[in-house]
Each structure stands twice: as C-alpha cells, then as structure tokens.
C-alpha cells in the first residue's frame, strides 16, 4: 500500500555545525519539526538509517552562504561540497554514493556569497544500512529549513 | 506491484570518454557494477532504452574537475554543460528533455577547480525511446561513480 | 492504482516574464505543450494546486543566461536564486519549501554567460494548497522548455 | 587530546637562521588555520604570522616580514617558522597555535603548544 | 596598525571579587576580540572570543562585552585559580594584535 513506504527529510540544525573547514560529517538534523519528517525509518546519531530493503530515491539540497559581517574568510578560494554516504552496520566501512559542488572565488569585492550544490540519485539500501552527510566548511552553511536538507523515499521493493 | 517497476543507475565509465571541447554524447557507461544497476529498461550502444510505456523521473549528475598536474587549460573560460535527451527510434530525431550547466573561469591562480551539476524531471516515456546524455568538455569529467551518473525509474503508468 | 497519482511537470512561458532584477514570483508557465504535462492538478493564476493530498515529490530546475548581444548587465555581480514555496488557502502566507542558487560575476571579459540551479525535496501537501516558484532576476531567464521548469508527482499517500 | 608539540628552539648567532616547527595530533589539522605568537622576556604576547589552512593565505607582522616564512605540511600535520636575519629582538618563547575557527579569521586561538625559546645572541 | 591599550596593568584583588578588565582599540574592530589567561611559564588559554562568546570548558564566572572599540572581561567572583595575567588581542583585516596585558595579583 502507499502509505507504508518509507521516507524522510532531514532538515539541517545549525546549533551544533563544526567550527572546520575540513570535510566533516553533519550529525545534527531535525526530524520532526517544520518541513522535516520521517516515517518508516530511523534518526539517529547524525545517520538516517534504513529499516525496510528497497530502492530509494536520496537526494540532497545544501547551501553555502558568507557576509562580510561574519568576518573575513581565511581563504577566498573555497571547496564547497557535499558528499552522500552509506556505512553498512555488518561492513563498518563508508561509501559515497553521491557527491557534488564547486570550487569558489569568494573575493572580498562582493559583500554576500551564495551557492546551493543539489544531489540525488535511486539506490538499493538494505535493512540496517545507514546514510549520513559530509560538507567540506561546515560553518558556511546556510542554517535555514529550505536550503540544507537531504532526505529519502522508498520507491519500489527488491526483486 | 512495486517490484515490478523499471529503473536505471547508469556510472560513467572513463576508460572510454572522448577528448575535446565540444558537445559529445557519452556512450559508455556502467550498468552492473558499484552503484549501477539496471531493471526492465535496457541499455544498448550508448543509450537507456525504455522498454515499458510510464511517466518516469529521469536525473543526472555531472561533475567536472581540473588539476593543475593535469596540464593547462585551452581555455580559462569553460561552458560546463549537460544534455539529457530523447530519442524515438520512429522519429530519428532527438530532443533534449533538460540541460543545466554552467560557465566557469577557471583561473591559472588556483591549482584545483571543480564543478557539479544535478538535473532531473518527470517525464512521460514510450517503449522503444532512448535517453542518453550529452555534456561538453568530456575530458573534464570525474570518472568516480558517485559523481557523473545518471538514471531513471517509474513513477506511473499512462492513462 | 499507480496511474491515479496526481503529477505536474510545468516549463516557462517566456512571453510574460517580468523584467527588474528584484525577487519575482512567475506566474506564466505551460501545463500542456512539449515536455509539460498535468494530471490530477490544476494549473492557475501562476500557481499549482494540489487537488489530492499526499507526500509528494517537488522539483525545480531555473537555467539563467546572458549574452553580450543582450546588452550591458547593469551589474556584474549577481545573485541568481530560485525559491520553491507553499501557500495554503486557509493560511494566506507564503512558505519557502526548497531554496537555491549562486551568487555569480558575471564579467564583461566573456561574452556569453550560463548558470543552472536544481533543486528537490519531499514535502506533505494537501489539497487546496499552491506551489510556486519565485526567481530573482527573471530577465535573466533561460526560455527553452528543457532549461527553466518545475514540477511535482506524488509518492504516497499520508497515513 | 588536541594538543601542538614545538621543537627547534635553541641559541642562534645573529644574521643567522632556525626553524621551528609544530606537529599537531587530536584534530584535523588540515582544516584549521595556524599562529605563531611570540613572547619576550618579561613581557606581553606578540602575534607574529598566520596561515590558512589550505596554505593558501599568509600574513605576517611587519616586524618579521621578508624574514619570516610560515609553512605546513598537511599531510605531516606539521606547522613550522622558517627565521632568518635574527636579531636579538627576536629573542623570544615561541609558542604555535590554532586558530579557533577554519574558515574565518578573528575567532581567537584556541589551543598552544607549550613554547620554544629562541635566543639570538654573539 | 591598531593599537590595544589595557587597563589597569596591574589589579589587586581579593578572592569573591567582581573584577573588571577594559581594553580599547584605536579604531573600530567590530566584535573581533578575545581574551586570554597565562599564567608564569605557561601558554595563554583562550576564554572569549568574539567579544562575548564563552570558549567550551570555561567557567561561567566568566564574561566578556562590547563592540567596536571598548571591550570588558569580567569575573564576576573571583577563585585562587584565577589569579594570572590577561590579555585582550584584536583581529582586523589581516591583522592581529594583543594587549600589553592584565596582572591580576592577591590583595
């Protein structure tokens, strides 16, 4: 039936973005507030993880952002990315099965910098299998529910 | 039955991209390997064939990228773009169903360059057409599966 | 039935796009002429409104362009973004489901200038409520069919 | 633990030259900015350079520029200060240390080494 | 440059005291402050940074305000572990300078 397939859109909690400019895994989303929601799977420790075998549709939306009054970038050339990846419980390695985004010039001449990197793609995810997100300069990222989310949605059962 | 509905994951298969800088159509691509997978569609010199009538969402995701050690561009000023395209086989004409893209500088001044991009649509498809995608650039391409893919699955059928 | 699901897929009408490089909503789209298409939605005053409640799928994909012929951009620093939003009749205010874009320089040095912005998420609507799409510098607008448009299907219905 | 473990001070003559360096462990070095601050005998604290972390961007102190060098080896997680020309008001505890945000200036330096003292003297 | 000037130099206190630091810059660094502690032979510690914002693992007692050119550390009762030197180090465009320093001695 319908109603039973699973999904979830995860939106971004910027209480607690890391200070780097590293690539890090973001381990703090909403689940159940404003846009975000999740049924049929699970939320937890910064990963969604997968509860029922099937084909999924993952995709991700996230939003780099810099004005002059938050200070000077230490770098005015920037790796903005974003990197989607599965961490299977029984093999505790990750894999990326998406990525995207761009090297910028944010030069001091502009006094707002803006740019959004958008994923998806259809992958066969097993019971347990878990999905989480790296950005590389976590504290550029723009902090709203419409612009850093990533989410999923079952689209059909394993054959 | 969920199970039953086509899809596709197709990953770039580098061994075999065109140089230049011109608009090339990309032949060569994985279907059952990593992150590819096919189900009920086909995949035949080059192109997704459709073998069952439906409303589809068709996505691709391009990523180009530069080192310096790869030698110097011809051009600063890049246009990086996607076609994705359709193609009867009754009408030997193709159409492009979506493109996105951009124009770069990418200057000598920074020793790596990099640049995605994600499109994707519904669209009602006939058996027996063919997507297949065309980018400039091609020697530009991140041959890695989790950055120049594209895919499609079943959404509906037709009325 | 898979073929009940309500879906749009709308591409710009570029006869009616407004000028200014402010925000704009656009209103003028196509629901039934080349790649778009509508069913069990209704198309109207600019808008898409859900006539069947669900979890449904909504994406975006604005293609800005400018070529020297065009004439002098009144600045060379640009911020070209796309905001997907949600109204609801009962609640006359807007809501930004999904945002993107790029802040650009798009300097005199190059005579021909592109950017694409893709955007996609999974959101809860019900019926009477109305997606939009909101652009700045609409003048800017790519107006081939494959280039700006929008869309939505539904995935599944709410529990 | 997060911590910066200088080496390379020592007595030097003048005119002459050191390197000083700083390995890093417990965070990821290659995403953080880096400092070195000296301080004189009995007195305050003196900035001296900063380096992005990329390695990109540097700025220096007038009092040392175009004799001082900072570098970094990310994949060695080692920061060092290559000095040359010393005088003997570069006698000074060296201390390294990390710039409290990667992708910002101004936030401030939340973890030092433990200091090394160079000394420029006949 | 911009110069950071710190008063008092030296402060004698009494453990429970509310102490205040002042620094002033010679023009306007926005919010682009922090304050530090050393104590004698060891490396400074970062307390405050951005004007106001308490460094993790800092005490409470603890605080900094102001904007643009005048700027207050305050502890609001002072402990035995308190007594050292502070200094105060500024950030604008590229460049970074400290205070001459705080000596919060016992009374």
């Known amino acids: 039936k319908l109603e039973a397939q699973p999904f979830a859109h995860l939106t971004i909690n910027a209480t607690d973005i890391p200070s780097g400019s590293h690539k890090v895994s973001l381990s703090s989303w909403y689940h159940d507030r404003g846009w975000a929601k999740i049924s049929n799977m699970t939320f937890s420790n910064g990963k969604l993880i997968v509860n029922q075998d099937g084909f999924y549709y993952l995709y991700a939306n996230i939003c780099f952002r810099h004005h002059e009054t938050s200070g000077d970038l230490a770098t005015e050339y920037l790796q903005l990315m974003v990197y989607v990846t599965k961490t299977s419980i029984k093999i505790p390695s990750s894999h990326t099965l998406m990525k995207g985004g761009s090297t910028k010039y944010w030069s001091g001449n502009s006094e707002f910098h803006f740019y959004s990197i958008n994923v998806g793609g259809f992958f066969k995810l097993r019971s347990g299998e878990e999905i989480s997100i790296e950005v590389s300069n976590p504290s550029l990222l723009d902090p709203d529910q419409d612009a850093t989310y990533f989410g999923a949605f079952k689209v059909r059962d394993i054959d | 039955k969920l199970e039953a509905q086509p899809f596709a994951h197709l990953t770039i298969n580098a061994t075999d991209i065109p140089s230049g800088s011109h608009k090339v159509s990309l032949s060569s691509w994985y279907h059952d390997r990593g992150w590819a997978k096919i189900s009920n569609m086909t995949f035949s010199n080059g192109k997704l064939i459709v073998n069952q009538d439906g409303f589809y969402y068709l996505y691709a995701n391009i990523c180009f990228r530069h080192h310096e050690t790869s030698g110097d561009l011809a051009t600063e000023y890049l246009q990086l773009m996607v076609y994705v395209t359709k193609t009867s086989i009754k009408i030997p004409s193709s159409h492009t169903l979506m493109k996105g893209g951009s124009t770069k500088y990418w200057s000598g001044n920074s020793e790596f360059h990099f640049y995605s991009i994600n499109v994707g649509g519904f669209f009602k498809l006939r058996s027996g057409e063919e997507i297949s995608i065309e980018v400039s650039n091609p020697s530009l391409l991140d041959p890695d599966q989790d950055a120049t893919y594209f895919g499609a699955f079943k959404v509906r059928d037709i009325d | 039935k898979l073929e009940a699901q309500p879906f749009a897929h709308l591409t710009i009408n570029a006869t009616d796009i407004p000028s200014g490089s402010h925000k704009v909503s656009l209103s003028s789209w196509y629901h039934d002429r080349g790649w778009a298409k509508i069913s069990n939605m209704t198309f109207s005053n600019g808008k898409l409104i859900v006539n069947q409640d669900g979890f449904y799928y909504l994406y975006a994909n604005i293609c800005f362009r400018h070529h020297e012929t065009s004439g002098d951009l009144a600045t060379e620093y640009l911020q070209l973004m796309v905001y997907v939003t949600k109204t609801s009749i009962k609640i006359p205010s807007s809501h930004t489901l999904m945002k993107g874009g790029s802040t650009k320089y798009w300097s005199g040095n190059s005579e021909f200038h592109f950017y694409s912005i893709n955007v996609g998420g999974f959101f809860k609507l019900r019926s009477g409520e109305e997606i939009s799409i909101e652009v700045s510098n609409p003048s800017l607008l790519d107006p081939d069919q494959d280039a700006t448009y929008f869309g939505a299907f539904k995935v599944r219905d709410i529990d | 633990q997060v911590q910066l473990v200088q080496s390379g001070g020592g007595v030097v003559q003048p005119g002459r030259s050191l390197r000083l360096s700083c390995a890093a462990s417990?965070?990821?070095?290659?995403?953080?900015?880096m400092h070195w601050v000296r301080q004189a005998p009995g007195k305050g604290l003196d900035w001296v350079t900063v380096?992005?972390?990329?390695?990109?961007?540097?700025h220096y102190a007038d009092s040392v520029k175009g004799r001082f060098t900072i570098s970094r080896d990310n994949s060695k997680n080692t920061l060092y200060l290559q000095m040359s020309s010393l005088g003997p008001e570069d006698t000074a505890v060296y201390y390294c240390a990390k710039s409290l945000s990667g992708t910002y200036w101004g936030y401030g330096m939340d973890v030092w080494g433990q200091g090394t003292t160079v000394t420029v003297s006949s | 440059d911009i110069q950071m000037t710190q008063s008092p130099s030296t402060l004698s206190a009494s453990v429970g005291d509310r102490v205040t630091i002042t620094c002033r810059a010679s023009?306007?660094?926005?919010?682009?402050l922090a304050w530090y502690q050393q104590k004698p032979g060891k490396a400074p510690k970062l307390l405050i940074y951005?004007?106001?914002s308490l460094e993790s693992g800092v005490p409470s007692r603890f605080s900094g305000s102001g904007s643009g050119t005048e700027f207050t550390l305050t502890v609001s009762s002072l402990q035995p572990d308190d007594f050292a030197t502070y200094y105060c180090q500024q950030y604008n465009r590229y460049s970074w300078t400290f205070g001459q320093g705080t000596k919060v001695e016992i009374k």
């Open positions: 023009q306007s660094i926005s919010s682009w």
């Open positions: 951005k004007a106001s």
């Open positions: 380096i992005s972390y990329d390695g990109s961007n540097k």
């Open positions: 417990g965070f990821t070095f290659s995403g953080y900015g």
